[in-house]
């Protein structure tokens, strides 16, 4: 159905944007609190949205040093913004067998951001691999 696939595309474009925000934050990794955070890796199929919410819930924080504090805080806030709802996300919410956030290995900010980026890329890959050819406007 065209409108639902366009909705999915818009949703994935948002994921695409999140990758850039993660990349931006990676430039300021030395200005982040060096706290260990749950960082899902090798996420099992159908648990991607659960893992995504773990990344969003993590307490990534600026160390409040230097003049990068504002851009770091804005970037973190954007990472935590709730993406538009999709059927795939709703379906996965009902899946109770996904690991809890606390069960994932904790990593420092650098590895945390790298794993977050990998998950976002995996989600985009799954989305683009499952749809027919033609771009987001087709």
């Amino acid at each position: 159905h065209k409108s639902s696939s366009q909705g999915q595309d818009r949703h994935m474009i948002r994921m695409r944007q999140l990758i850039d925000i993660v990349d931006q934050l990676k430039n300021y990794v030395n200005d982040l609190v060096p706290e260990f955070l749950p960082a899902p890796e090798d996420v099992e199929t159908n648990c991607e949205w659960s893992a995504f919410s773990c990344f969003q819930k993590a307490q990534l924080k600026s160390a409040n040093t230097g003049n990068n504090e504002r851009i770091i805080n804005v970037s973190i806030k954007k990472l935590k913004r709730k993406p538009p709802s999709t059927n795939a996300g709703r379906r996965q919410k009902h899946r109770l067998t996904c690991p809890s956030c606390d069960s994932y290995e904790k990593k420092p900010p650098k590895e945390f951001l790298e794993r977050f980026k990998s998950l976002l890329q995996k989600m985009i890959h799954q989305h683009l691999s499952s749809r027919t050819h033609g771009s987001e406007d087709s």
């Epitope: 818009r10 944007q17 804005v74 890329q121 985009i124 890959h125």
Partner: antibody, heavy 116, light 107 residues
Framework: QVQLQQPGSELVMPGASVKMSCKAS????????MHWVKQRPGQGLEWIGT????????IYSQNFKGKATLTVDESSSTAYMLLSSLTSEDSAVYFC?????????WGQGTSVTVSS | DIQLTQTTSSLSASLGDRVTISCRAS??????LNWYQQTPDGTVKLLIY???RLHSGVPSRFSGSGSGTDYSLTISNLEQEDIATYFC?????????FGGGTKLEIK
Amino acid sequence: QVQLQQPGSELVMPGASVKMSCKASGYIFTDYWMHWVKQRPGQGLEWIGTIDPSDNYTIYSQNFKGKATLTVDESSSTAYMLLSSLTSEDSAVYFCARYGFAMDYWGQGTSVTVSS
Amino acid sequence: DIQLTQTTSSLSASLGDRVTISCRASQDISNFLNWYQQTPDGTVKLLIYYTSRLHSGVPSRFSGSGSGTDYSLTISNLEQEDIATYFCQQGHTLPRTFGGGTKLEIK
């Protein structure tokens, strides 16, 4: 259909600034980030930076920090790029491009000539 | 920064030919590779995104393939309107970077 309209050319003095526009139509302006790209005569393409029109969040290439400033006017669906302290190195064509999964729609480019 | 190398800067072909343009990345870019066409009048258009996805309105004679660090754009049946410069671009990591371009000319 998606369109990005840019003025054709700008002639500016060395040391001055120039603010170029990119008027978007045919889609929801705030749903897509806008990227800017530089092309020197006979050269390749160089990424300048991007802006999220929904909240003015910007990311710049290291090469253009302090040189380019990206802004938007949501009410007119227009993105702007200000280039400051212009030198002959800034003489180029500057493109705006909407970013979905890629830079899927491009403006025609604004040709900036820096000359006294 | 990720470097993209288009080893062939210019290419001559005849109408109807099958043409392949290559692009190599300095590191694995996980298929986040796009192809653009710049026509002689300066107009830039997206052809292919995410290695092999055809952008809407692009003729099916254009196709893309590749993985890891090596990617290619193929035009299966060259037409006059395909005379242009073709750029690859990676969307894997900031900053966005482009290949140097491959200019396609008619023999």
